[in-house]
Amino acid sequence: ECGHISVSAPIVHLGDPITASCIIKQNCSHLDPEPQILWRLGAELQPGGRQQRLSDGTQESIITLPHLNHTQAFLSCALNWGNSLQILDQVELRAGYPPAIPHNLSCLMNLTTSSLICQWEPGPETHLPTSFTLKSFKSRGNCQTQGDSILDCVPKDGQSHCSIPRKHLLLYQNMGIWVQAENALGTSMSPQLCLDPMDVVALEPPMLRTMDPSPEAAPPQAGCLQLSWEPWQPGLHINQKCELRHKPQRGEASWALVGPLPLEALQYELCGLLPATAYTLQIRCIRWPLPGHWSDWSPSLELRTTERAPTHHHHHHHH
């Protein structure tokens, strides 16, 4: 090893200067007594190296790159050796930005997987390896006082979400939750959420069904549909309100919303629809009056309204 590069910092802010030194040992006897050290950034030769012989006989070249505008590049020092360039040493330089503050942190309590799933937006590209950690603690109050820390949740590479398993959660008790982003240039932290996992519970939607006609019940009127729904059993004891949406299967009509309906209604007659028309219907629910998140919309139910009852008018007026 005839040469060795040292740099002021291998990782810098994009656009910042960087200073490097290349030292050639004296005992590289095959070299010229006064070799000229050359610098190359990537494939481009870099002028401006200041070379000197040190007291111990080694040669040193120092270069300052005024702006490192590459997010990644190799800086090498070399000598002309015959007709070719002999590279003595090279270092990888990285440039980028410190992590921005992660924002839009939000969490959902999934009762099926028994986990609190939190997601966030990481902010602009840093061009550097940046790690995100979901940090949390239990708190008896409103998160001003920190209780037991909860094991850090580290997302898989490239993911901006993480799941805290049930064993680290305490329902009906507040948790402080935030995201920490870290890379070689710095650390940032999102604003802290303070939440009770049950207040961000996301329910599964009920299952929509057509109401079984009973012999004693009157059939639905024209333009009406009789619906029933089966609540999602694991969420049965959670007070909820629900809403329906419907639209004709054909045409470009947008969804029409009907609600709020109490989950307990369990059956509903939807009227004011077009007769003899196929409709698509869906239902969703939310924990209420306590806080919660809307469930997804249920799988679609497709039903057809009955024909309009025949009229006894013999004359049709065309306008």
Partner: antibody
């Protein structure tokens, strides 16, 4: 403090009827599911029925379906269990309990003994 | 219906012992498993809800674990007041069902 107080138990002949009541205090009764759980002498716990906060949903155990009716009066903070066509095997201590959102029972009343015997 | 099987049905232990009671569901119930303690002539008392959440006022020597079909109630160091019968209960779907109980007796 949440309190549940059952009443209405007693001795009844097979085929007879009885109405149990549970007076609730210390919480907003109208916001919670309520339920009845029974325990035959020397036996384990058996869920009987539950009722949703406004009374619209009332699941029952198969063993009492069609014979027992659960109801509530939110204005009186009271839960009821109407028991008809009683059988010897209905003999038990009947507990009323408040249901948590994920289906646990807490707290429980002190229980009322129903004895069905001729 | 979901059947709940508790084991053992009874056990003898000494004060200070670590005691473990298991409960198995006949089908997956996620974390919808609750544990109760009942003393003779008294109403049951909730210890653990949603598999691992300690009810307010319950000593921290009680803990719950498990998910799916297999669950455990652990008493880390048995105290004289812990001699009682313990029940598990699933709340995943109706009918709500209880295990047969485990009686913890003094050795």
């Amino acid at each position: 403090e949440v309190q549940l107080l059952e009443s209405g138990g007693g001795l009844v002949q097979p085929g007879g009827s009885l109405r149990l009541s549970c007076a609730a205090s210390g919480f907003t009764f109208s916001l919670y599911w309520m339920g009845w759980v029974r325990q035959a002498p020397g036996k384990g716990l058996e869920w009987v029925s539950s009722i949703s906060s406004s009374g619209g949903v009332t699941p029952y155990a198969d063993s009492v379906k069609g014979r027992f009716t659960i109801s509530r009066d939110n204005s009186k903070n009271t839960l009821y269990l109407q028991m008809n066509s009683l059988r010897a095997e209905d003999t038990a201590v009947y507990y009323c309990a408040k249901l948590g959102e994920l289906g646990w029972f807490d707290p429980w009343g002190q229980g009322t003994l129903v004895t069905v015997s001729s | 219906d979901i059947q709940m099987t508790q084991s053992p049905s009874s056990l003898s232990a000494s004060v200070g012992d670590r005691v473990t009671i298991t409960c198995r569901a006949s089908q997956g119930i996620s974390s919808y498993l609750n544990w109760y303690q009942q003393k003779p002539g008294k109403a049951p008392k909730l210890l653990i809800y949603y598999a691992s959440n300690l009810q307010n006022g319950v000593p921290s020597r009680f803990s719950g674990s498990g998910s799916g079909t297999d669950f455990t109630l652990t008493i880390s160091s048995l105290q004289p007041e812990d001699f009682a019968t313990y029940y598990c209960q699933q709340s995943y779907s109706t009918p709500l069902t209880f295990g047969g109980g485990t009686k913890v007796e003094i050795k």
